[in-house]
């Protein structure tokens, strides 16, 4: 006997359509775009019913239910607004992601639509979340000062400044919300003993009890750095276990643009901050900074051949800063900190140098401070940041 004529569910159709359906005849149900087959609570990839000999179909007809993309993922350092309507997450619904203003920016426009495949999709067809990238290089510091000849910093002047506490005091510069740039010699030996590295930020007072704590997940020392054999390639990166929240007191320093070389010529002034030795020979209690001009590379190299630093020479991977007469310099305890410059076009500060080495008498005449030249290491920095995939000792590149 024939089976009853099947009725297509709303937003669906039946195929094939026949005058009658007898034993072993079958039909399938197809939903229109944006709808899915649903049997009770269960989504089906396809549906076919077969007419049985007792004149009944072997399974009930499902419904065609509108696709539901579900609640959108939370956006770190941002939020999502429902554009179509409150909590509407069904086919063709629109949501808008946006980043926390002032301290984060979004690369895309942040608009996503619930598509027929059940995924929230951007106008570019991306199904992954947009990224809220930290703003870099904003500072309340205008410019002018061991640190020798320095002056105290104010809140928001050097929000990228990081205090590294281990066996010795050193510094670093936040270059992302989970990466710190520093000198290789400041963290050498810390790849195995990472737990002994105490990372603090958002502070002016070195001994402040209120700070943002970070811990290292991995330490990357430049493969060209050899400890105790000069300071060539004196650069390292610390991957933080957790991202830090960006605010006016904690913010990355920008990496130099390709045009940065024109902003770091001889006599151009940079600024360096730190808690290192001051004129009095003690570590500074408050973060100090000094504005110092870049010194001609050859002049600096010659000065250090006259009065050589044990085992070190000025290489192409270094830049020098200081006054001929002395008086303004970084010193022990400032190692790893950033020598920064203002990019007049973007009005953002960028890191040009990393405090590396200098004469034993900080701030001595013709004994310039020597800094790792960051522009030479942009590919190295980007390569490590882009390729780092998680924890594990195989990520700890060191000599």
């Amino acid at each position: 006997q024939p089976c009853p004529d099947p009725t297509a569910p709303p937003n669906g159709h039946i195929s094939p359509v026949q005058a009658t359906y007898v034993l072993k005849d079958s039909f399938s149900v197809f939903c229109k775009t944006g709808f899915e087959l649903l049997q009770g609570s269960v989504p089906l990839k396809s549906f076919t019913a077969v007419c049985q000999k007792d004149g009944s179909w072997d399974r009930p007809i499902p419904e065609c239910s509108i696709i539901d993309c579900g609640p959108p993922d939370d956006l770190p350092n941002g939020h999502v607004d429902y554009i179509t309507g409150p909590e509407v997450t069904t086919y063709k619904a629109v949501i808008q992601y946006s980043c926390e203003e002032t301290f984060y920016t979004m690369s895309s426009n942040g608009k996503y639509v619930c598509e027929a495949d059940g995924f929230w999709t951007s106008s570019k067809g991306e199904k992954s979340l947009p990224v809220c990238k930290p703003v870099c290089g904003l500072s309340t510091h205008t410019s002018g000062g061991q640190i020798i000849g320095g002056q105290p910093a104010k809140p928001g002047d050097f929000p990228w400044q990081v205090l590294l506490l281990g066996e010795t005091t050193a510094a670093g510069a936040l270059i992302h919300d989970d990466w710190v740039l520093t000198a290789a010699h400041a963290v050498y030996g810390k790849t195995e003993a990472m737990s002994s590295l105490d990372i603090r930020m958002g502070i002016l007072k070195r001994l402040s009890l209120i700070y943002t704590q970070a811990w290292p997940e991995a330490v990357f020392i430049h493969e060209g750095y050899t400890h105790g054999a000069g300071f060539d390639n004196d650069i390292a990166l610390i991957k933080l276990k957790n991202k830090v929240t960006i605010n006016r007191n904690i913010m990355p320093i920008c990496l130099p643009r390709k045009e940065a070389a024109s902003l770091m010529k001889t006599d151009f002034v940079g600024t360096v901050a730190g808690w290192g030795l001051t004129q009095k020979g003690f570590l500074a209690r408050n973060l100090m900074f000094v504005d110092i001009p870049i010194v001609d590379h050859q002049k600096c190299a010659t000065a250090y051949t006259k009065q050589p630093y044990p085992g070190a020479k000025v290489t192409v991977n270094m830049l020098c800063a200081g006054l001929d007469r002395g008086g303004k310099d970084a010193c022990r305890g400032d190692s790893g900190g950033a020598l920064v410059f203002l990019d007049n076009e973007t009005q953002r500060w960028f890191v040009g140098g990393i405090v590396s080495w200098g004469s034993i008498n900080c701030g001595g005449s013709e004994q310039y401070g020597v800094y790792t030249k960051v522009t030479n290491y942009i590919p190295w920095i980007e390569n490590i940041i882009n390729n780092f995939g998680g924890g594990g000792s195989h990520h700890h590149h060191h000599h």
């Epitope: 609570s41 990839k45 539901d68």
Partner: antibody, heavy 118, light 107 residues
Framework: QVQLQESGPGLVKPSETLSLTCTVS??????????WGWIRQPPGKGLEWIGS???????YYNPSLKSRVTISVDTSKNQFSLKLSSVTAADTAVYYC??????????WGQGTMVTVSS | SYELMQPPSMSVSPGQTASITCSGD??????AYWYQQKPGQSPVLVIY???KRPSGIPERFSGSNSGNTATLTISGTQAMDEADYYC?????????FGGGTKLTVLG
């Protein structure tokens, strides 16, 4: 944020009926978007689906348990319940309730251990 | 009755990719779901409808399903991913779970 909480006796005698209730908070059990399900897990073993119910009372059960299972819903109390009759030691398990949204169980309750023993 | 088969255990080094399989007759014709269960905790949905991630599940979790096999892939596996993983599917409106795979993250 919807939350589910199972409640009921932790010890049931063989041949008796196991009765558990799941209380839903932070959302309405009468939502047309969801079914509500029961799943169990014997100690050290895997998960087993027991059955699911819609707020209207429509149910579907695991065929291997169908003869012994009854799932009901009380929309006024925002609760749904499980009854499993003629229990044996093999029914000793952690019993979970969960929201069934288009075939996926999310979220789950914390689970309640039920031991069948005389 | 419909059955889903999973390997009882597997191990992976941190940072490596773990692929957990689930096999069943014509499993690719229906949707597969994956749950993570840590000791003493309730299961948590990590993948639904073959390849969709619920809100809050890290992007390193992904899924696929074709032929007779569904696969849960965890790329860049972390220590916190050590858990039991269960596949699940619906066959004729009956919920079926696999036996579970214990994933151990070495080191």
């Amino acid at each position: 944020q919807v939350q589910l909480q199972e409640s009921g006796p932790g010890l049931v005698k063989p041949s008796e009926t196991l009765s558990l209730t799941c209380t839903v908070s932070g959302g309405s059990i009468s939502s047309s978007s969801y079914y509500w399900g029961w799943i169990r897990q014997p100690p050290g073993k895997g998960l087993e689906w027991i059955g699911s119910i819609y707020y209207s009372g429509s149910t579907y059960y695991n065929p291997s348990l169908k003869s012994r299972v009854t799932i009901s819903v009380d929309t006024s109390k925002n609760q749904f319940s499980l009854k499993l009759s003629s229990v044996t030691a093999a029914d000793t398990a952690v019993y979970y309730c969960a929201r069934d949204r288009r075939g996926r169980f999310d979220p789950w309750g914390q689970g309640t251990m039920v031991t069948v023993s005389s | 009755s419909y059955e889903l088969m999973q390997p009882p255990s597997m191990s992976v080094s941190p940072g490596q990719t773990a692929s957990i399989t689930c096999s069943g007759d014509k499993l690719g014709d229906i949707y597969a779901y994956w749950y993570q269960q840590k000791p003493g905790q309730s299961p948590v949905l990590v993948i639904y409808q073959d390849n969709k991630r619920p809100s809050g599940i890290p992007e390193r979790f992904s899924g696929s399903n074709s032929g007779n096999t569904a696969t849960l892939t965890i790329s860049g596996t972390q220590a916190m991913d050590e858990a039991d993983y269960y596949c699940q599917a619906w066959e004729s409106s009956t919920g079926v779970f696999g036996g579970g795979t214990k994933l151990t993250v070495l080191g």
